[in-house]
Each structure stands twice: as structure tokens, then as C-alpha cells.
């Protein structure tokens, strides 16, 4: 077949006339949209057949595919057919009209489809949008065919701009018919069971009418078959469940349980597996370390957490100094044990606005009929230090003494410092640290007492200054793990009135 002009794509002017010629060794015919438009057929003296299609007064609606084929019933092969695509840019035609069935696109599986919105001008920029969205979708466009890609079940429209007006196509509706994609889910009532307890597994598939369930499980290999039960769930159609129930489990029933589901229509299948552990008896075991000494800060809230594994579910008790704790009505203590996975638990003791009296020996005990575990720790209440007293005195010996007294938990450290230049200190000059130096200028004496009832340390430190010849700023700083406190006093020479 010979087509003149050869194409494969032509751009023709609106209102013009154009002639297409096709010739071949047998009778030929032009086809447009599966029909034969009026055309002139002839046979030349040399035996060549031809057909002339004259397109007059062209409009945008003449845009599209034109085929030349052999016009006989010999069923010639498809390559004996020439395709030509003609564009007739026409500003009065936006998108080419579609048949109603072209607006509804049905799919039975995930596959590439074409949304057939076509324009008359190959130079126009065309974009694809969800019907209710402005954002253009990143899908490739072919001016001869439309947008091709994988689409979700949505409504789509095409947009283009002709001159200064925006033109929308009809809406295209994509429907995905869920025939037979199989998606299996498997779960167990418990994945850990004790010897003698039941194993119950469920395999669920949705949306398929004809399915076959096949289970593989440790007991099956040893020839002991269990008959599964198929349950048609009633909350929605084709929600089918297979239940495998093994009464009185044995240790050998531990292992992998697999549910394989096949669908006979398209021979699709899917399988999922789950591991089951049969234990001789129950267990409780601690996970992670909890230090034997724990800290809480006075008047702050503190949560103490213990993580453990157990089966079957255990009873959890907390004790303080061997007395059972419970949630207090005043809301000072809160106890909670959470099941964070099938066999993992988190038990928490929360002390709200911690008081000194809450220091002591704490124990968490988790137990059931088969096993128990306990964890103990000492809770220390940390109290920020505070300087309670800083005083200066002039004993008869001629030396001058400064006494600093403070409290805190854990035991506070005491730091003495002095500053001789009152104008520049401490902003410009760092204070000088004082203590038991080799020089005889100052001497330090510190005593520490632990007060059992208040559960804190008291520090009393006396600084002896030998020669004070000008005013001196003396600072006492107490420091511990949870804070520091400072006071200062001005020490003046004996000779100067204060």
C-alpha cells in the first residue's frame, strides 16, 4: 500500500480542502472511525488500484485516524493497512467528542490504560487532573491518543488553553473491578501457648467468591491431620475465614503455620505464615536492667518503669518497705501495668510530687501459677541544696571566722571563695577560691551530719581568716547533684567600723 502524502501525521488548515490517495495491487479503501467515507475508487491500466479521499471544508472534527486497507475478503494480514493521523487545528473545537462508553473505563487488574482526551492542535499543552483537583498529574500525553498510565478508581478531566480561554474535557470515570486479587491475613488467638492449651489460628480473605484454603503446620508433617473450619463472615460479602483449631497443644506443635489461599477463576494465590511457640510451662522474665539505687527529686514527679515478658498474663504487685502499694485516693501514687505486645508488659509506679517520706526500699513482683520474678531497688529522694546560714564573727584571738551551714541530698560540696576588689568583683575579676592552703591566710573546718528523719545531709563549714586588712567579700557555695545555692557576706578588718 502506498499513501500520498505519506504522513504518518499531517497538520491541515481549517476550512481547507485536502486530497488523500491510497494505491495498491488489490482494491483499496479509506476508513475513518470504522466507516468508509465517500471516495473515488479506480483501477489503472497497469492493474494498480487506487482510492482518492477528498476532505472538503475541514473542521476540527475531521481530526483523527485515517486508514487505507485492502477492500476484499481475503483476510489479509494487519500489516496490509496504512495509518495516517490528521490534525485540523480549530479554535472552535476544544476536546474531540467521545462516545459514552469511552468515558467509562473498566479494569479487572492493575494495568496501563489510556484516558482518550484529544485536541485538534498538536501544539496545545494538555494537562490531566482529578475531577475535583487543580494539580496537574504527571502522566505522559500523546496528542493522537491521550494520557496513558496506571490510574486509580477516580474521576479525571483534561484541560487545555485555546487562545485565552481554558477548556475542560468531559469527565472520565475509572472503575477497578475487584475480581480476584487475593490478600490473605493470618492471626492467632495466642502465638504462645502452654502445653495442653489450645492453638487457634484464623486465615482471612476478602472479595473472592471461590477460594480454597490449605494449611501447613508442624503436626501435619507427622501425619496427624486437623480439619479446618471455613467460616463465612457476615459483616460484608465474600469475607471468608478458615479456622485451624488444635486442641491440647504439645511441644512438637511449635513452629510455622502457613495458610495458602488459591482462587480458581484466575488461579491467583497468596499465603501468609505465623509462628507459634508451645512452652512446657508459663514464664516471667525481666527485660533490661534496673539499677539497685534509683533517684527522685523532691516535689517533682517520678515514674519508675519495669519491663518484663510473661505468659500467661501475670499478677503485678508493688511494695514499699514490704508493705503493698495501691493507687492512693489522694493521687500521690499511680500504679499501671500495660500489655504492650502479646507477652510483653510494662509496669509503672508513678510518684506524684515526691515527698521525703517516699524514700525507701521498693519491690515489684510479677507472678502467676507457674513462675514469678521480683525486682527491688532503693529510692533516694534528692533535695536541692540550700544555704541556711552564713555568719561572720570576731573571736578574741584576733582572727575572723565565717560560718556557713546548709542542707541537701545527696551530700553537698562546699566551696569558699573571696573577692578583695569589691568594685570589680565578681563581674570583672574571678573570685579567689579559699581553703586549707599552705599559706596561713585561711583555714577551713567542715562537719557533715546525716539527719535520718529528714533523709538529708547537713554541712557546717567554718572559715578562719588570719589577716583581714581591707573589706573582703566572702562567698559560700553549696553544690550537689540537683542544684546549687550561694550566699555572701562582707568581712571588714577589726580596725574598721562596719
Amino acid at each position: 500500500l502506498v499513501v500520498t502524502p505519506p504522513g504518518p501525521e499531517l497538520v491541515l488548515n481549517v476550512s481547507s480542502t485536502f486530497v488523500l490517495t491510497c494505491s495498491g495491487s488489490a482494491p483499496v479503501v479509506w476508513e475513518r472511525m470504522s466507516q468508509e467515507p465517500p471516495q473515488e475508487m479506480a483501477k489503472a491500466q497497469d492493474g494498480t488500484f487506487s482510492s482518492v479521499l477528498t476532505l472538503t471544508n475541514l473542521t476540527g472534527l475531521d481530526t483523527g485516524e485515517y486508514f487505507c486497507t485492502h477492500n476484499d475478503s481475503r483476510g489479509l494480514e494487519t500489516d496490509e493497512r496504512k495509518r495516517l493521523y490528521i490534525f485540523v487545528p480549530d479554535p472552535t473545537v476544544g476536546f474531540l467528542p467521545n462516545d459514552a462508553e469511552e468515558l467509562f473505563i473498566f479494569l479487572t487488574e492493575i494495568t496501563e490504560i489510556t484516558i482518550p482526551c484529544r485536541v485538534t492542535d498538536p501544539q496545545l499543552v494538555v494537562t490531566l487532573h482529578e475531577k475535583k483537583g487543580d494539580v496537574a498529574l504527571p502522566v505522559p500525553y500523546d496528542h493522537q491518543r491521550g494520557f496513558s498510565g496506571i490510574f486509580e478508581d477516580r474521576s479525571y478531566i483534561c484541560k487545555t488553553t485555546i487562545g485565552d480561554r481554558e477548556v475542560d474535557s468531559d469527565a472520565y470515570y475509572v472503575y477497578r473491578l475487584q475480581v480476584s486479587s487475593i490478600n490473605v491475613s493470618v492471626n492467632a488467638v495466642q502465638t504462645v501457648v502452654r502445653q495442653g492449651e489450645n492453638i487457634t489460628l484464623m486465615c482471612i480473605v476478602i472479595g473472592n467468591e471461590v477460594v480454597n484454603f490449605e494449611w501447613t503446620y508442624p503436626r501435619k508433617e507427622s501425619g496427624r491431620l486437623v480439619e479446618p473450619v471455613t467460616d463465612f463472615l457476615l459483616d460484608m460479602p465474600y469475607h471468608i475465614r478458615s479456622i485451624l483449631h488444635i486442641p491440647s497443644a504439645e511441644l512438637e506443635d511449635s513452629g510455622t503455620y502457613t495458610c495458602n489461599v488459591t482462587e480458581s477463576v484466575n488461579d491467583h494465590q497468596d499465603e501468609k505464615a505465623i509462628n507459634i511457640t508451645v512452652v512446657e510451662s508459663g514464664y516471667v522474665r525481666l527485660l533490661g536492667e534496673v539499677g539497685t539505687l534509683q533517684f527522685a527529686e523532691l516535689h517533682r514527679s517520678r515514674t519508675l518503669q519495669v519491663v518484663f515478658e510473661a505468659y500467661p498474663p501475670p499478677t503485678v504487685l508493688w511494695f514499699k518497705d514490704n508493705r503493698t502499694l495501691g493507687d492512693s485516693s489522694a493521687g500521690e501514687i499511680a500504679l499501671s501495668t500495660r500489655n504492650v505486645s502479646e507477652t510483653r508488659y510494662v509496669s509503672e509506679l508513678t510518684l506524684v510530687r515526691v515527698k521525703v517520706a517516699e524514700a525507701g526500699h521498693y519491690t515489684m513482683r510479677a507472678f502467676h501459677e507457674d513462675a514469678e520474678v521480683q525486682l527491688s531497688f532503693q529510692l533516694q529522694i534528692n533535695v536541692p541544696v540550700r544555704v541556711l546560714e552564713l555568719s561572720e564573727s570576731h573571736p578574741d584571738s584576733g582572727e575572723q571566722t565565717v560560718r556557713c551551714r546548709g542542707r541537701g541530698m545527696p551530700q553537698p560540696n562546699i566551696i569558699w571563695s573571696a573577692c578583695r576588689d569589691l568594685k570589680r568583683c565578681p563581674r570583672e575579676l574571678p573570685p579567689t577560691l579559699l581553703g586549707n592552703s599552705s599559706e596561713e591566710e585561711s583555714q577551713l573546718e567542715t562537719n557533715v551530719t546525716y539527719w535520718e528523719e529528714e533523709q538529708e545531709f547537713e554541712v557546717v563549714s567554718t572559715l578562719r581568716l588570719q589577716h583581714v586588712d581591707r573589706p573582703l567579700s566572702v562567698r559560700c557555695t553549696l553544690r550537689n547533684a540537683v542544684g546549687q545555692d550561694t550566699q555572701e557576706v562582707i568581712v571588714v578588718p577589726h580596725s574598721l567600723p562596719f
Partner: antibody, heavy 119, light 106 residues
């Protein structure tokens, strides 16, 4: 031939209890989900409760949850509806119906039993 | 919960007339709708399932159509034995019946 025969209906005072039964024959009972559907005098049909073929799952309309219990005995080919805390608005003909496996629409119905709740 | 609105609630037609009943769901029910016929004092009888599939033994004058939320039940040529109340029911998510349509002969 599939047959469903309901029994157990009658007159009961508000707050009282009643147990309906449905005897099934002509099909393998344990392969089918079953349901109770009711119809108040002069009114339309109303689904009440369903139970899966194994008896492992039950479903109820909101207005009867906590008051009605659907159960079955596959060995006896029987379906039951235990109705407690009955109210005047529970007065109806109660039909036993069979679910078709998988699709779940009701394919066969019994002739119904009348429950009247009145003081 | 899915609601089913059935209309009309009653209609009167002559023998041979075409009768149409509609049911609208409050959300898409994916063609999971069935139609039942109930005669006075009798149990309901299944006529159509999955929108348009006729049960065996049901005369071909009964038909169903629709998709998404909107469904139609049609009797192409009303016969005297068709006097009954007709119900739709959705089974996409549990079960909800329409209010029923009583069909009478003029």
C-alpha cells in the same frame, strides 16, 4: 427441600424474656450463616442479628445489642434468639433466615413466629 | 450505618403496566442489593440478588439495575399475582432493608 420452622413466640410483659428457636432441615446447617429478621405489625422488614456458620462470630443491630443473644447448635440443626429486657417496640413477627455462603444475602426464610410485648 | 430509602411507598397500576421501584443507599453499596417480594401473611421471597441476577424460578418480567448508590427494580408487565410488598436490602455492610413498596392493581 430447605425448611426453616420458628417456635417460641408468645405474649410477654415489658422487661421479660423469651427464647425463640428455629429448626432447620433440607441442607447442611453447619455450612450456612443464619439470621433473625423481624417485622412489626403493618411495618417493614428489619434485620435483627446474624451468626456465622461455625458460630464463631455474631452481629446485632444497635437497638438489640446487650439485650438479645443469637446462638446455634450445629449438632441439633437449630438456631436460637434469647431476648431479654423486652420492650413494646420489640413486638413483631420474627423470621429465621438463611444466609447464602459468601455473598450473605438471605435466600430462604421461615414462616415466622409472633412475639408480643405488652403489659 | 447504611440507610436505604425506597420509593414510592405504594403504587397502583393496571395489569400489563410497567412498574418501577427505586432504592437509594446513603453510600455506595457496590451492587450488593437484593429484592424481595412479600405477600400478606407470608414470608419474603428472594427475586433478585447482586443488583440484577434473577433467582431461578423467578419470571423474567422482573429485573433490576443500578450502581453506586442508586438502584431500580422493574416489573415490565404487571400481572395480578404480582400484588405484594417489595423490599430492597443492602448487604454490602451488614443488612438494611428499604421501607417497602406496596403494589396494588387499579
Amino acid at each position: 427441600e430447605v425448611q426453616l420452622v420458628e417456635s417460641g413466640g408468645g405474649l410477654v410483659q415489658p422487661g421479660g424474656s423469651l427464647r425463640l428457636s428455629c429448626a432447620a432441615s433440607g441442607f447442611t446447617f453447619s455450612n450456612y450463616g443464619m439470621a433473625w429478621v423481624r417485622q412489626a405489625p403493618g411495618k417493614g422488614l428489619e434485620w435483627v442479628a446474624s451468626i456465622t456458620n461455625s458460630g464463631g462470630n455474631t452481629y446485632y443491630r444497635d437497638s438489640v445489642k446487650g439485650r438479645f443473644t443469637i446462638s446455634r447448635d450445629n449438632a441439633k440443626n437449630s438456631l436460637y434468639l434469647q431476648m431479654n429486657s423486652l420492650r413494646a417496640e420489640d413486638t413483631a413477627v420474627y423470621y429465621c433466615a438463611r444466609h447464602t455462603p459468601g455473598a450473605n444475602y438471605f435466600d430462604y426464610w421461615g414462616q415466622g413466629t409472633m412475639v408480643t410485648v405488652s403489659s | 450505618d447504611i440507610q436505604m430509602t425506597q420509593s414510592p411507598s405504594s403504587l397502583s397500576a393496571s395489569v400489563g403496566d410497567r412498574v418501577t421501584i427505586t432504592c437509594q443507599a446513603s453510600q455506595s453499596i457496590k451492587n450488593y442489593i437484593a429484592w424481595y417480594q412479600q405477600k400478606p401473611g407470608k414470608a419474603p421471597r428472594l427475586l433478585i440478588r447482586y443488583t440484577s441476577t434473577l433467582e431461578s424460578g423467578v419470571p423474567s418480567r422482573f429485573s433490576g439495575s443500578g450502581s453506586g448508590r442508586d438502584y431500580t427494580f422493574t416489573i415490565s408487565s404487571l400481572q395480578p399475582e404480582d400484588i405484594a410488598t417489595y423490599y430492597c436490602v443492602q448487604y454490602a455492610n451488614l443488612y438494611t432493608f428499604g421501607g417497602g413498596t406496596k403494589v396494588e392493581i387499579k
